[in-house]
Interface confidence: medium
């Protein structure tokens, strides 16, 4: 005979698991259901009646399949200088990230306290290690035989053109130049630049059961440009 | 206007347990940190620690910590700083303070205080 | 922990006059260009009240003879004409990591 289905809430089998989207109910000593994604247990189980769920408030959420007896806040609204990269529903959590060209430089568990510009390397420095959410652009001297004439925290140093014949030498911070028409070998026109650090943040979960720490969510503290580093601007 | 209102003086004997709360009006409660910070008679500011009220996240300064719990009622807006296996020591005045998330960094609205004397 | 030292304990000063406190830092305090310093004013029976964050910046609602400067360990609180209701107790705090510290005060009063 095919095994019966049980249906919430029912006692397990001594040494066996509730089900997938159930939980073990310790006061009831039952199996219960879980509460979907966006919903929060209302009511608990007993022995006689199922998990009640309701709907997720106003800025607050459940990610997973739970029986958290409250929903989680979205964190704080994000700053006029930073990105909504993920909106506050009653599933996720918002996430606001530091605008293009900044990176987390004070950091809690809710997230980003403080956002600053990343580094730009002056002209003679090109970008050694790139900016990313958590790190600052890294600035190196050009070496020689390569220049870097911009202010940037992307472009990288880039070797001097090759002539037949050097109408002026060139230095850290500028390209050789060429008398004859055409240089024997040249770099492609126009500066090398770095891609600009892209969001890695992985998906955010929330505990379950345990409901008492929330996902993180970056912050911005609106600030004005850092000093110069050597090799940099703060521009 | 934001306001922090904290609750009444208690006495309190030594190895007793001390809760005192403090509710928050005239701002978004979940989104910024509210810090405790105490003051003992005569004495300088020390900092306890910090509650997000938004997750219930805590940070204790580590000379607290084992003694000290830090809860909300976010649909109250109301902090909770509780002080366990008191000594006399921890007569002082006890401080919530918000400290917003970004922005100042700093403890920009203070409660009045309350009163804790621990005493046999 | 960051310690934070102020100079100096006490300080009597005219009506009118300047006052300077000193607050230094066991480590930097500063991040990015930022410092993490601020400045509360405290006078008897009262919670502090913030009159100075991140080193230099002026609270809503305080008058403009306070000021703030400094970065890195060094950091100075100037009132620039003592007023009789500046008569108060000073400290400075650190909230660039936990724990947050505070100096141990400076009382201004009227020479």
């Known amino acids: 005979l095919p095994a019966q289905v049980a249906f919430t809430p029912y006692a397990p089998e001594p040494g066996s698991t509730c089900r997938l989207r159930e939980y073990y109910d310790q006061t009831a000593q039952m199996c219960c259901s879980k509460c979907s994604p966006g919903q929060h247990a209302k009511v608990f189980c007993t022995k006689t009646s199922d998990t009640v769920c309701d709907s997720c408030e106003d800025s607050t959420y459940t990610q997973l399949w739970n029986w958290v007896p409250e929903c989680l806040s979205c964190g704080s609204r994000c700053s006029s200088d930073q990105v909504e990269t993920q909106a506050c529903t009653r599933e996720q959590n918002r996430i606001c990230t530091c605008r293009p060209g900044w990176y987390c430089a004070l950091s809690k568990q809710e997230g980003c306290r403080l956002c600053a510009p990343l580094r730009k390397c002056r002209p003679g420095f090109g970008v050694a290690r790139p900016g990313t959410e958590t790190s600052d652009v890294v600035c190196k001297p050009c070496a020689p035989g390569t220049f870097s004439n911009t202010t940037s925290s992307t472009d990288i140093c880039r070797p001097h053109q090759i002539c037949n014949v050097v109408a002026i030498p060139g230095n850290a911070s500028m390209d050789a130049v060429c008398t004859s028409t055409s240089p024997t070998r040249s770099m492609a026109p126009g500066a090398v630049h770095l891609p600009q650090p892209v969001s890695t943040r992985s998906q955010h979960t929330q505990p379950t059961p345990e409901p008492s720490t929330a996902p993180s969510t970056s912050f911005l503290l609106p600030m004005g440009p850092s000093p110069p580093a050597e090799g940099s601007t703060g521009d | 206007q934001v306001q922090l209102v904290q609750s009444g003086a208690e006495v309190k004997k030594p190895g007793a347990s001390v809760k005192v709360s403090c509710k928050a009006s005239?701002?978004?409660?979940?989104?910024?940190?509210i810090d405790w910070v105490r003051q003992a008679t005569g004495q300088g500011l020390e900092w306890m620690g910090e509650?997000?009220?938004?997750?219930?996240?805590?940070y204790y300064n580590e000379k607290f910590k084992g003694r000290v719990t830090m809860t909300r009622n976010k649909s109250i807006s109301t902090a909770y700083m509780e002080l366990s296996s008191l000594r006399s020591e921890d007569t002082a005045v006890y401080y919530c303070?918000?400290?917003?998330?970004?922005?100042?960094?700093?403890?920009?609205?203070w409660g009045q205080g309350t009163l804790v004397t621990v005493s046999s | 922990d960051i310690v934070l030292t102020q100079s100096p304990d006490s300080l009597a000063v005219s009506l009118g006059e300047r006052a300077t406190i000193n607050c230094r830092a066991s480590?930097?305090?500063?991040?990015?260009?930022?410092?993490?310093m601020h400045w509360y004013q405290q006078k008897p029976g009262q919670p502090p009240k913030l009159l100075i964050y991140?080193?230099?910046n002026l609270e809503s609602g305080v008058p403009d003879r306070f000021s703030g400067s400094g970065s890195g360990t060094d950091f100075t609180l100037t009132i620039s004409s003592l007023q009789a209701e500046d008569v108060a107790v000073y400290y400075c705090?650190?909230?660039?990591?936990?724990?947050?510290?505070f100096g141990q005060g400076t009382k201004v009063e009227i020479k």
């Open positions: 005239g701002y978004t409660f979940t989104d910024d940190y």
């Open positions: 991140r080193a230099s």
């Open positions: 480590e930097s305090v500063d991040n990015s260009g930022n410092s993490f």
């Open positions: 509650i997000y009220p938004g997750s219930g996240n805590t």
């Open positions: 705090q650190q909230s660039k990591e936990d724990p947050y510290t």
């Open positions: 303070a918000r400290s917003q998330v970004y922005g100042k960094i700093a403890m920009d609205h």
